[in-house]
Each structure stands twice: as structure tokens, then as C-alpha cells.
């Protein structure tokens, strides 16, 4: 057992990289750092489980952009990131950092998060070794950091694979060695095969000689996939440098836990029982306490290392880990020239003047998806529709009661009554008309225009 | 856990009124679009109206034009909807949804029926 | 308003078998298609959108393939939690319409 220790140094753009901050026009935020360890050199799949661990760091300092500043190296989190791993430490490993930023301004539902930078890396590492330093670039982006494997007593070399055993002596006895930092607890280390490579190889019993990921051959001097003679087997010919026939692949079992060797050109495989990983089948089974659904992600089953767990994944991320984010806005939700943003819980579509609706689906200048209440009817004209209202409507979409008389329609000092059908005016002695805006003539005669026969002045008079 | 609980429905003579409230609790309810969602019984799902994340925008199907109205109070994390004039048609198992973006319809509540019978 | 069919509209099958469910739209609607599915006295439940995407925490068992009028909804390896109704629906332009639905039941 033991921890992987990753500590990020900076982050910001790198040479030739944005002058200005990404986050402009955008609210405060703060990173954050999610760090997965794979076994292996091999290029795996984007989704594949983070075998050997993962972490989350803290958040970041809150940031805010200052408009038209040159963007400095952003705030980081405090501390470590650490991914504790058990069993072996496979030596070789693919890690993978992703920075994300967390926007807390005032955008729809609190905070959102989006991934900025994303870097793999593939490394042989010992354990115990010192510190590795790293520059990755990342788009526009610069990331430094460093990281280590230490194994954590009473695990101890360059795998994590030998015990410290406590002894009574204060002191250590002949040919045992101080396992630091306690003097009370010392090693007897193994005694491997004859020239068994101290670099590359290890062993766990006497006259063992068991290579780290990427090396092979009897004493482990050989690279894995670079010789060009990978059809043969064997050791190191002093004379070719290629191999020639000797031990297979398979010979003393590589594979841990009781997993079944088969070999493969200049290698060999580890079909590995329920519950355990890794190219010797050394990751021992992931369970849902060890946390490994990220991003929110439930974890379901998994109780023990002998059941798989399954990672039930919030909106906006997939992959059997729920460490992928997934892009909605690929899937080109917003019709009509929306544009779609991604909040991670939720998609916006801001749409173009002239559409609406949650995906913009709805074209406000259109009749044919209008409907006007009431009995109102759509009509368009120069690119734009408008409803023409029953009496008694109004509004955009006639969905208004309209008080006819709201408007003082009544000239004169008439008095209006609102009708099913529209309004009346009662108008004042001396006027006449729809709206009352004809006075009449002493001699009964309205001044314009005629009055209709058989109204006379004062009588209510309809308007349509 | 997202979760819409509806609540209002019961019997109801034609031509009465009908408030159904869905009251939404583990995400922020400000940030959708929310749908109102029916299925008589027996038959199939049949949209009934939606409404923005502010309630600036609503939309109808034809048949409830007019005599149905959906609001919602983000301060209360309810959506409503208010029936008027209710047919022995509308009777239904009502359901709310909500919308996420990419789709309509991510997670529904348990629905509530309406039965409109004189 | 765009209409959309399903067929068939009851399925018998058995335990481990793989079905498809096929979908028709009067009208071409890109790819803005989903499938539910509604078991008796509940509520449905999101399976797949924008006719192919999963949706989160639904069985890799379920696909969806189509695009402008012709949508297939496929369940591998059926178990009995799987008989249930099944829907279809456009998200293309309001109304939002469904499918009439297709009935999976064990045989």
C-alpha cells in the first residue's frame, strides 16, 4: 500500500498562449483539480475505471477577472492531492489532471462547472523515488507539477510489495537494515536471482526475479516492445542484442491473485479473477467505498472487492466512472441559430430574435405555430405576426379581458357601457355620434356629418 | 434526489375549476423550463403546456388554449396550473416535468388525477 | 401539429430476447426524438434522447437510432423488469406530441 502525492505548482496560460483570461465576461470563480491514476502504459479507453485511485482537490481561492488584464497565473487550491493505492505499486501508470473552474456568479442555478484543461501523461515511476517535475500544455494552457509514489509502512521498495517486520532489538541485527523512520523496525531483504535488474526488477521470495510493468526478460533488462527481435524469446544476447530463446513470458506466473498467464508477441496477458485489476492483476477489486464515481456520480453495488459497482452519473457526465463530460451542446439542441450553453445540470438556449421556447423551436413570426385566444386571429405581415382580437381582447396573444370603456372613448362628458359586443355611449344633451363627437345645431341638426334617421341627440349610441 | 410531487386533483363537475400544484425539491426549480404532462386513462401521453424559467414564456396545446393557465412561483419552488371550464375530456392522470434542456422531459413527478363527471 | 406512429403496438417476447420498437413522424424532425418508458400505475421514465443519447443512469441495453422521420428504439437481453409501454416523442416544434405507445409483454 501507499500513496500517490501529485502537487500542482501553477496554472496559467502558457507562452504564446491566451493573452487574456478565458473567464472575461464571466462572474468570480475558482479551480479545482481531479487527478486518476490508471495502471499501465497501454492507451486506454477515455472512460476506463481509474483503477489505481483518484482524488478531487479543494477549491481554489476565489478569482475574479479584471477586464482587459493580462491573465496572471490563476489562484490554486492548498495541499496535496493524494491517491492512496493498495496492493502493489505497478511502476508504470498513466496519470491524468483535469482542471476545472467553478463559475459562482449570478448565472441560473447556483454554481456551474466546466473543464478548462485536461492532460495525460504516461510515466514510469519507483516508489520512494524523489519528486518528478512535469510542464504539460494544454491548449492554450500551461500546467507545472510534480508528483511522487511512496509506499506506506510497512510496505516498503520500489513497488510497495516488501514488509517492514517490527523487531524487540532496538537495534537491527546482522543483515537486517533500517526500515526509516523507526529503528525499531528493520527488513530482510530478499535475496532476488542473480542479476536481477535493481532498477527494473523485484522480487517477494528468495531467487525471484519479477519485472515492473514495461520491462521483461529472466533479470527485467529487457523494454517491453523495443527490441526488434520481439518474436523471440529469452535473454539478452550480448552478441545481436536481440533476444534468444530461453524462459517464456509466462514462466513463473507474472500474474498475482491468482490470475491465468496466456502470452502475446514479446509479452503476455493476465486474465484476472472477479475483483482484481491491472496488468498482474495487483489493483485489487474497487468497491463504492473507495469512492469511485466522480462528479457527483451514485455509486450502486460494490459492496465488496467480488461484486462490480456501478456509477450512476449526473446530468452532463458518463463513462463508467462518470469522469467524462459529456458535451450536449454537440447534440445541437438549439434549433433556428440558438446558441446553447452549457450550465453542467441544465442546457440554455439563448435564442435569435424571432424564436423562443426551451430550444428555440418556436418562430414568433409564424402563424402556422401561433395561436391567438379567443377567437383571435393571426395575422403576418413584414416578417412579424400580430393577433387581431375579439371584442372584449386584447393583449399579445388575446388572452387579455379588454375593458372597452378603459379608454374614455365617450367625447363630450358621454358616459360609456360596456356590451357584449363592444361598448355604448350615452352622450351628453347637445352631442351626438358613435363616440359623441358631433354636438348638434339648435335646430336638432348635427354639424357633421348626418346623423342617422332616427337617432336623436342624447340617445345611447353603439360603437363597434 | 429530484423530486415533483403533484397534488390538487379530485373530482370535479363540467364546467367547474381546477388548481393542480407540483412542488419540485432537489435541484434549483429556477433554472428550468417546467411542463405540465397528461394521460387519460388507458391512453397515451399527452402534452398540456410548459412555461420558461421565469415565466415569461408559456405555450399551450390547442385544446386547452384559453381555458387552461400554467404559472409558477420560483420562491416556492411550485409550478401550477389552473383549469377552467373543464370537459369530461380533460380527464386525466396530470403529470409534472421537468425540462432540462437537451430534452423535454428528465424527470416526472407521480402525477395526480383529475376527473371531470357531473 | 406532427403526428407520430408506433409500431407495433403490443410486442410479445421472451426473457434474453431483443426487440425493436420503430417510430414514424409526419414530418421530418431531425434527430429531436425521445423514448420513454411507463409501467402500469407509474409515472415514465427518460430513457433516450435526441433520438441516440442515453440518458444518465439508463442501461447501456437501450439504443435509439433514426433521424428525420424513421426512429427504432432496440432493448438487448430483455429482462422482466423491461415489459412495460414504451412512447415516442417529438420535441421538434410545439405541440410536443407522443406516439400511442407499444406494449411489451412477456410471452
Known amino acids: 500500500a501507499g500513496v500517490f502525492e501529485l502537487q500542482i505548482h501553477s496554472f496559467g496560460p502558457g507562452p504564446g498562449g491566451a493573452p487574456r483570461s478565458p473567464y472575461s465576461a464571466r462572474g468570480p470563480c475558482r479551480l479545482f483539480f481531479r487527478v486518476c491514476l490508471k495502471p499501465g502504459l497501454s492507451e486506454e479507453a477515455a472512460e476506463s475505471p481509474c483503477a489505481l485511485g483518484a482524488a478531487l482537490s479543494a477549491r481554489g481561492p476565489v478569482y475574479t477577472e479584471q477586464p482587459e488584464a493580462p491573465a496572471p497565473d490563476l489562484p490554486l487550491p492548498n495541499g496535496l492531492l493524494q491517491v492512496p493505492f493498495r496492493d502493489a505499486w505497478p511502476g508504470t501508470f498513466s496519470l491524468i489532471i483535469e482542471t476545472w473552474r467553478e463559475e459562482l456568479g449570478d448565472q441560473i442555478g447556483g454554481p456551474a462547472w466546466s473543464l478548462l484543461a485536461r492532460v495525460t501523461r504516461r510515466r514510469r515511476l519507483a516508489a520512494g523515488g524523489p519528486w518528478a517535475g512535469d510542464i504539460q500544455r494544454a491548449g492554450a494552457w500551461e500546467l507545472r507539477f510534480s508528483y511522487r509514489a511512496r509506499c506506506e509502512l510497512p510496505a516498503v521498495g520500489t513497488a510497495c510489495t516488501r514488509l517492514c517486520r517490527p523487531r524487540s532489538a532496538s537495534r537491527c541485527g546482522p543483515g537486517l537494515r533500517p526500515c526509516a523512520p523507526l529503528e525499531d523496525e528493520c527488513e530482510a531483504p530478499p535475496v532476488c536471482r542473480a542479476g536481477c535488474s535493481l532498477e527494473h526488477g523485484f522480487c517477494e521470495q528468495p531467487g525471484e526475479c519479477r519485472c515492473l510493468e514495461g520491462w521483461t526478460g529472466p533479470l527485467c533488462m529487457v523494454p517491453v516492445s523495443t527490441s526488434s527481435c520481439l518474436g523471440l524469446r529469452g535473454p539478452s544476447s550480448t552478441t545481436t542484442g536481440c533476444l534468444v530463446p530461453g524462459p517464456g513470458p509466462c514462466d513463473g506466473n507474472p500474474c498475482a491473485n491468482g490470475g491465468s498467464c496466456s502470452e502475446t508477441p514479446g509479452s503476455f496477458e493476465c486474465t484476472c479473477p472477479r475483483g482484481f485489476y491491472g496488468l498482474r492483476c495487483e489493483v485489487s477489486g474497487v468497491t463504492c467505498a473507495d469512492g469511485p464515481c466522480f462528479n457527483g456520480g451514485l455509486c450502486v453495488g460494490g459492496a465488496d472487492p467480488d461484486s462490480a459497482y456501478i456509477c450512476h452519473c449526473p446530468p452532463g457526465f458518463q463513462g463508467s466512472n462518470c469522469e467524462k463530460r459529456v458535451d450536449r451542446c454537440s447534440l445541437q439542441p438549439c434549433r433556428n441559430g440558438g446558441l446553447c450553453l452549457d450550465l453542467g445540470h441544465a442546457l440554455r438556449c439563448r435564442c435569435r430574435a424571432g424564436f423562443a421556447g426551451p430550444r428555440c423551436e418556436h418562430d414568433l413570426n409564424d402563424c402556422a405555430g401561433r395561436a391567438c385566444a379567443n377567437g383571435g386571429t393571426c395575422v403576418e405581415g413584414g416578417g412579424a405576426h400580430r393577433c387581431s382580437c375579439a371584442l372584449g381582447f386584447g393583449g399579445r396573444d388575446c388572452r387579455e379581458r379588454a375593458d372597452p370603456c378603459a379608454a374614455r372613448p365617450c367625447a363630450h362628458g358621454g358616459r360609456c357601457y360596456a356590451h357584449f359586443s363592444g361598448l355604448v355611449c350615452a352622450c351628453a344633451p347637445g352631442y351626438m355620434g358613435a363616440r359623441c363627437e358631433f354636438p348638434v345645431h339648435p335646430d336638432g341638426v348635427s354639424a357633421l356629418p348626418a346623423a342617422p334617421p332616427g337617432l336623436r341627440p342624447g340617445d345611447p349610441q353603439r360603437y363597434p | 434526489e429530484v423530486q415533483l410531487v403533484e397534488s390538487g386533483g379530485g373530482l370535479v363537475q363540467p364546467g367547474g375549476s381546477q388548481r393542480l400544484s407540483c412542488a419540485a425539491s432537489?435541484?434549483?426549480?429556477?433554472?428550468?423550463?417546467m411542463n405540465w404532462v397528461r394521460q387519460a386513462p388507458g391512453k397515451g401521453l399527452e402534452w398540456v403546456a410548459n412555461i420558461k424559467e421565469d415565466g415569461s414564456e408559456k405555450y399551450y396545446v390547442d385544446s386547452v388554449k384559453g381555458r387552461f393557465t400554467i404559472s409558477r412561483d420560483n420562491a416556492k419552488n411550485s409550478l401550477y396550473l389552473q383549469m377552467n371550464s373543464l370537459r369530461a375530456e380533460d380527464t386525466a392522470v396530470y403529470y409534472c416535468?421537468?425540462?432540462?434542456?437537451?430534452?423535454?422531459?428528465?424527470?416526472w413527478g407521480q402525477g395526480t388525477l383529475v376527473t371531470v363527471s357531473s | 401539429d406532427i403526428q407520430m406512429s408506433q409500431s407495433p403496438s403490443s410486442l410479445s417476447a421472451s426473457v434474453g430476447d431483443r426487440v425493436t420498437i420503430t417510430c414514424r413522424a409526419s414530418?421530418?424532425?431531425?434527430?429531436?426524438l425521445a423514448w420513454f418508458q411507463q409501467k402500469p400505475g407509474k409515472a415514465p421514465k427518460s430513457l433516450i434522447y435526441?433520438?441516440?443519447s442515453l440518458q444518465s443512469g439508463v442501461p447501456s441495453k437501450f439504443s435509439g437510432s433514426g433521424s428525420g422521420t424513421d426512429f427504432t428504439l432496440a432493448i438487448s437481453s430483455l429482462q422482466p423488469e423491461d415489459f412495460a409501454t414504451y412512447y415516442c416523442q417529438q420535441y421538434n416544434s410545439f405541440p410536443y406530441t407522443f406516439g400511442q405507445g407499444t406494449t411489451l409483454e412477456i410471452k
Open positions: 435526441a433520438a441516440s
Open positions: 416535468a421537468r425540462d432540462p434542456g437537451w430534452a423535454p422531459f428528465d424527470y
Open positions: 432537489g435541484f434549483t426549480f429556477s433554472s428550468y423550463w
Open positions: 414530418q421530418g424532425i431531425s434527430n429531436y
